[in-house]
Interface confidence: low
């Protein structure tokens, strides 16, 4: 059985090969049970967590994980050396920075040690699974009487990231969003000095170095402007 798994994580061409034993039609063995899907995320290229839903097993099972890189200098099969646990059952594996090679095809194999023929292999493009840390050190300064510039830092060289800025005043019901490329700065051309503004930013590893779909966490917010006005109708609505 050769299955293509479509996942919402930027790896739509991922193939998973499930190696199942042949069983008589009138019996059902544990080796026919599909293994849970492995989901991997690379956090700021500092470490990678590959996890699976251990509770999907019919009985508690310490599944094992092996990995290698296809068609590369790093194609030797490696055992997971740092398992993650959920209620004392293996539910993931953490790989460190030196074990992460973004631009080579990562092959991950999950196996049931009690039924070695029960195994599933997935191929992942790690550059599409990077989640950067949230932007830091947000700063605001006035370019002119009515224009603000927002700057921030990321713990990457910046050309690999795109950003999403959200801002709103304390009068607004919702955020206004603006996409920003790798230049990591944003200008707001028309600022109302009577209002208090809140800004926040998140980042994504896209499009120059990878095609990740997942955004970082939001930065800590930064504020600009006068303190909340007592005449703010939206605040009255919230308090009512």
């Amino acid at each position: 059985l050769n299955t293509t798994i479509l996942t919402p994580n930027g790896n739509e061409d991922t193939t998973a090969d499930f190696f199942l034993t042949t069983m008589p039609t009138d019996s059902l063995s544990v080796s026919t049970l599909p293994l849970p899907e492995v989901q991997c995320f690379v956090f700021n290229v500092e470490y990678m967590n590959c996890t699976w839903n251990s509770s999907s097993e019919p009985q508690p099972t310490n599944l094992t994980l092996h990995y290698w890189y296809k068609n590369s200098d790093n194609d030797k099969v490696q055992k997971c050396s740092h398992y993650l646990f959920s209620e004392e059952i293996t539910s993931g594996c953490q790989l460190q920075k030196k074990e992460i090679h973004l631009y080579q095809t990562f092959v991950v194999q999950l196996q049931d040690p009690r039924e070695p023929r029960r195994q599933a292999t997935q191929m992942l493009k790690l550059q599409n699974l990077v989640i950067p840390w949230a932007p830091e050190n947000l700063t605001l300064h006035k370019l002119s009487e009515s224009q603000l510039e927002l700057n921030w830092n990321n713990r990457f060289l910046n050309h690999c990231l795109e950003h999403l800025v959200q801002y709103r005043t304390d009068w607004d019901h919702s955020w206004t969003e603006q996409s920003v490329d790798y230049r990591h700065k944003f200008s707001l051309p028309s600022v109302d000095g009577q209002k208090r503004y809140t800004f926040r930013v998140r980042s994504r590893f896209n499009p120059l170095c990878g095609s990740a779909q997942h955004w970082s966490e939001w930065s800590h917010p930064i504020h600009w402007g006068s303190n909340t006005s007592k005449e703010n109708p939206f605040l009255f609505a919230l308090e009512a």
């Epitope: 290229v45 920075k97 631009y103």
Partner: nanobody, 120 residues
């Protein structure tokens, strides 16, 4: 063991040109994404340009139209052609390879650098 050795830097007048080279060994150069980054005295590291294994190139706005990145896979060498140099291009120039070439505090995958000084 990844090894990267930059060369070709020097003192040049504004408007002049230089060609930097980076000799690579210890990894499969042809399948690696390669980059040039630079660091001016007292400033943070700045990405300059990248060339992917497939040949695609990307440049920072500050050097677009003046610098050209290229590679010779047969020679395991990365190049950066610097034209129309300005005083603000003065920096130490480093080449870096794919695994973490964008990751700002990882020094294990870049060379020792070559100094470029633009001054009249």
């Amino acid at each position: 063991q990844v090894q990267l050795q930059e060369s070709g830097g020097g003192l040049v007048q504004p408007g002049g040109s230089l060609r930097l080279s980076c000799a690579a060994s210890g990894f499969t150069f042809s399948s690696a994404h390669m980059s040039w980054v630079r660091q001016a005295p007292g400033k943070g590291r700045e990405w300059i340009a990248s060339i992917y294994s497939g040949g695609g190139t990307f440049y920072a706005d500050s050097v677009k139209g003046r610098f050209t990145i290229s590679r010779d896979n047969a020679k395991n060498t990365l190049y950066l052609q610097l034209n129309s140099l300005k005083a603000e291009d003065t920096a130490m120039y480093y080449c870096a390879t794919n695994r973490l070439h964008y990751y700002s505090d990882d020094d294990s995958l870049r060379g020792q650098g070559t100094q470029v000084t633009v001054s009249s």
